[in-house]
Interface confidence: low
């Protein structure tokens, strides 16, 4: 019968020829006048046999990306009568893989969009490589993946590129962030190829800013002819969230008097003091009123944001008017 | 099972050469590298290059660059040390190891090694 | 000099635990597997650890390695008299492109 060994010959070697093994009928002890042919495609052209011994040699360089076996079959003949010693038989010869491809990364570019000061363990986004390498051979298609840019407020599951926030981030500090990943192949051990990808990474805005009143004191007038519903001033406060959540709405905190109102321009984002009743010089000249501010949207889960509202203090001063007919009797 | 069966001592003079044989057995010889290693007396090992019995490709430590020259036959399953200017340092025990099929795995199995003693 | 730096001997007990110690650098532990091998007098070089903690079939498990950044360390415990013997770290260097013997370790067991 034929005796051989499995077959294998690694891809991309450099060499001229390459012993693949060797075919032979256990009838061959050497001194037979035994002939040895090899038949089936790549035979003559990627492989060889030497006829006298039947030993194989590749002689091309073999890519197992393209090709990853050949399917081959073999005769000997016994050239004292010419008749086949073994029944033809087919044999394979596998290419065995190198690492000659390097990860590349799928669906790129990558972007993503999480909430601002989201915890430790968010997931972010999963980046997925993929090498083109054999996955059943050794771990030239196995990659580990690794944070080159991003750190400290990113890491990568090494296996599963799954991208995870690792640390807390204030969008009004910074809103967007560039993680540059690496894929390296071999498990990442010596010898291994890598391929790297960028992803970009948008804070979105959470409400965890309160407004705050630009100024601590306002000072306002009216004149005391003013009918009520007039406005007579504004005030205005800043909120470093973005959107809805900087959406404010201005009210009166303290007004002993209850003589005015605020009202919230939603488009300008003031805070406009109106005359809810009409002043009069001669009875009080000046007037002190609180006004807070608060978000107009505020989650319950965000409410530790917002404890204490600001506030400011403004000061009215009323405008004297002379009165027609006025005088002593 | 795995031999690497090494040639026996020699003596030479300096600025000869040595050609050590390592014969290969219990393993298909063209599937893992050859290193050699050598040991000076009561010194510890020193690596001196490493050939792929398949293509025939070598490497050698820079120290032994132009000195060394690795060899096989594929015929006898052999692999070939060859040192060429010898001087007295080069006194020391040579062994041939099988490596992995990458050159950072360990060397698994060693030769017994040969004295290669140089004096004048 | 070795690239590798253990200590030149280590003495112990039967019965005792004692670490053998290799430093390296980047270029060779900091990158690469670290191998360990025993040598007992007048013998060839044994593979002992390789892959930095794997024991080959027929090492007692009271051998152990340990890898951590561009150090590593062999332990014995258990120590018995025949582990008295050379013991050195070897491990692949990228920047010489070669491999990387540590100087030895004399193990001295005493009785």
């Known amino acids: 019968g034929w005796v051989w060994n499995q077959f294998f010959v690694p891809e991309e070697m450099n060499t001229t020829s390459h012993h693949v093994g060797r075919l032979r009928s256990d009838l061959d002890n050497g001194n037979n006048s035994f002939q040895y042919k090899l038949l089936g495609a790549g035979a003559g052209s990627t492989f060889i046999i030497d006829e006298r011994t039947g030993d194989i040699y590749a002689i091309e360089k073999l890519d197992r990306e393209e090709r990853s076996l050949y399917i081959l079959r073999a005769q000997v003949i016994d050239i004292t009568t010419g008749r086949a010693v073994e029944p033809e038989s087919e044999f394979v010869i596998k290419v065995s893989d190198i690492n000659d491809n390097e990860p590349k990364f799928l669906d790129e570019p990558y972007e993503a969009i999480v909430p601002e000061m989201s915890p430790e363990g968010t997931l972010v986004i999963q980046v997925t490589a993929s090498d083109a390498d054999d996955p059943s051979s050794g771990n030239n298609a196995r990659l580990l993946y690794s944070l080159l840019q991003g750190q400290p407020y990113f890491s990568v599951e090494p296996t599963t590129g799954v991208i995870r926030i690792s640390s807390k981030m204030d969008r009004e500090l910074q809103d967007e962030y560039w993680v540059i990943i690496q894929a390296k192949d071999m498990i990442g051990q010596p010898g291994a190829l890598s391929g790297t990808t960028s992803v970009l990474i948008k804070l979105s805005d959470v409400n965890d800013n309160k407004p705050i009143f630009k100024e601590s004191l306002y000072r306002l007038t009216v004149s005391e002819s003013a009918p009520t519903g007039t406005s007579i001033g504004t005030i205005m406060a800043y909120d470093n969230d973005i959107g809805e959540n900087a959406e404010m709405d201005y009210s009166i905190e303290e007004d002993d008097s209850q003589t005015f109102d605020i009202i919230t321009n939603h488009e300008t984002q003031e805070g406009i003091v109106i005359l809810k009743k009409k002043v009069n010089f001669e009875h009080q000249n000046h007037y002190g009123i609180r006004a807070k501010v608060k978000n107009h949207h505020v989650d319950e889960q965000l409410m530790k944001y917002h404890t204490e509202a600001s506030t400011t203090f403004i000061k009215i001063q009323v405008e004297d008017v002379d009165e027609p007919g006025g005088g002593g009797s | 099972q795995v031999q690497l069966v090494q040639s026996g001592a020699e003596v030479k003079k300096p600025g000869a050469s040595v050609k050590v044989s390592c014969k290969v057995s219990?393993?298909?010889?063209?599937?893992?590298?050859i290193h050699w290693v050598r040991q000076a007396p009561g010194q510890g090992l020193e690596w001196m290059g490493i050939i792929n019995p398949i293509s025939v490709s070598t490497s050698y430590a820079q120290k032994f660059q132009g000195r060394v020259t690795m060899t096989r036959d594929t015929s006898t399953s052999t692999v070939f040390m060859e040192l060429s200017s010898l001087r007295s340092e080069d006194t020391a025990v040579y062994y041939c190891?099988?490596?992995?099929?990458?050159?950072?795995?360990?060397?698994?199995?060693w030769g017994q090694g040969t004295l290669v003693t140089v004096s004048s | 000099q070795s690239a590798l730096t253990q200590p030149p001997s280590v003495t112990g007990t039967p019965g005792q635990r004692v670490t053998i110690s290799c430093s390296g650098s980047?270029?060779?532990?900091?990158?690469?597997?670290v191998n360990w091998y025993q040598q007992l007098p007048g013998t060839a070089p044994k593979v002992l650890i390789y892959t930095n903690n794997q024991r080959p079939s027929g090492v007692p498990d009271r051998f152990s390695g340990s890898k951590s950044g561009t150090s590593a360390s062999l332990a014995i415990s258990g120590l018995q008299s025949e582990d008295e013997a050379d013991y050195y770290c070897a491990t692949w260097d990228e920047s010489m492109q070669g491999w990387v013997f540590g100087g030895g370790t004399k193990l001295t067991v005493l009785s």
């Open positions: 219990g393993y298909t010889f063209t599937s893992y590298f």
């Open positions: 190891a099988r490596g992995g099929i990458q050159l950072w795995l360990h060397l698994d199995y």
């Open positions: 980047r270029s060779n532990i900091g990158s690469n597997f």
